[in-house]
Amino acid sequence: EVEKTACPSGKKAREIDESLIFYKKWELEACVDAALLATQMDRVNAIPFTYEQLDVLKHKLDELYPQGYPESVIQHLGYLFLKMSPEDIRKWNVTSLETLKALLEVNKGHEMSPQVATLIDRFVKGRGQLDKDTLDTLTAFYPGYLCSLSPEELSSVPPSSIWAVRPQDLDTCDPRQLDVLYPKARLAFQNMNGSEYFVKIQSFLGGAPTEDLKALSQQNVSMDLATFMKLRTDAVLPLTVAEVQKLLGPHVEGLKAEERHRPVRDWILRQRQDDLDTLGLGLQGGIPNGYLVLDLSMQEALS
């Protein structure tokens, strides 16, 4: 589209500078040497080339590096990154966190594009694991990044990286993802004292097993209802009324408002009505007095 035979007299670019923004697309194509462009990539981002002009500059780099750009060029792409396709990015080998940061900065404030997703994928695969510095960087730019990973991908996150995770980074995680992250968080925060530990582990509790919830109930943690509602139903069901009361502390009154929703609804069905009545909240639906509760799952396990 922008191919032209010759550069007009006197327009040959000797360096990449501001004068080039006044060139038409075909003039850029004809008058800018690809090797000059590659060696002076650091200047490109300082010059406000338009989106169309960037097309031409990309075309020149593509011709110079058909197998993929070297990192020395990639780290200075700046706004030119917006022109890259996932196919282009799959040819790259990005190893420097500074390069990653520079490219994410260009996309700042936008949703994660397919280009950015591909870039991150290439970077993380190149590193072999999602280390703390990388996770720090990615969640700073994309708070929902962790929850976009599969449980398999999350399994490569080392416990030390969990320190970089903020509560909002887990907002969109599903139970399968929290199942993977919770044990890592437990390991990462194991040396903290009770109240500090709870503050850190709270966002991960959607992956906690029953025995850990029982342990927390002994520590006066006063879990809020929002956290309780995100707990695994199978982890909540075995808790006694007394344990839930201790776990929630003053927030126990909130159970009434949630009695029709999981996991509260399912938990109520498993409790003796007598025990529920001790809470004084008017929770209904427990096992009537005098009924015998058989734990069939235990019977199956024994046979």
């Epitope: 038409k24 406000p48 936008h110």
Partner: antibody, heavy 118, light 107 residues
Framework: EVQLQQSGAELVKPGASVKLSCTAS????????MHWVKQRTEQGLEWIGR????????KYAPKFQGKATITADTSSNTAYLQLSSLTSEDTAVYYC???????????WGQGTSVTVSS | DIVMTQSQKFMSTSVGDRVSITCKAS??????VGWYQQKPGQSPKALIY???NRHTGVPDRFTGSGSGTDFTLTISNVQSEDLADYFC?????????FGGGTKLVIK
Amino acid sequence: EVQLQQSGAELVKPGASVKLSCTASAFNIKDYYMHWVKQRTEQGLEWIGRIDPEDGETKYAPKFQGKATITADTSSNTAYLQLSSLTSEDTAVYYCASGSGTGAMDYWGQGTSVTVSS
Amino acid sequence: DIVMTQSQKFMSTSVGDRVSITCKASQNVRTAVGWYQQKPGQSPKALIYLASNRHTGVPDRFTGSGSGTDFTLTISNVQSEDLADYFCLQHWNSPYTFGGGTKLVIK
């Protein structure tokens, strides 16, 4: 002095077509992009599209694709805007403007008023 | 399309005052913004290109600033001949788009 001289006012019937011209003096249109802009009474400016007279390459705003056709004749140093299937919505003043590679519009014609009425 | 918003439709000022007209882009347009003046019954005239550069012949009381998404045209020592509509234009990506305009009214 750089000047863009546009053709005179047009009164046309609905469904018809019209072709407006814009002739440059004191510069060669091949060295610039030539843009066309629409302005309806008491309303803002809308970019219709542009042409590179050097090679005839055009770019249009999606809204005007199919409605507008921009051409250029370098021998007469003139750019043209053709509007087809005219309706009352096309009643407006149309400006041509010249600009460099940045896409900015540096010099403007005096405008051509197009009135679509039966 | 990139939307250019000029939130003030009218601005009232007095001769000798300083006035700032703003324009906000819906996404980053770097410095690819121009400012245009249109006096009643006339065609637009380019004042500022690439956000902060004055066109030839434009008085130095007109100053442009900004980059990214926020842009300002400042007229210091306003003169009666500055009564006009002022439009911003983004030419970072096509379709190029104009702001809705700000009419400067002299008290």
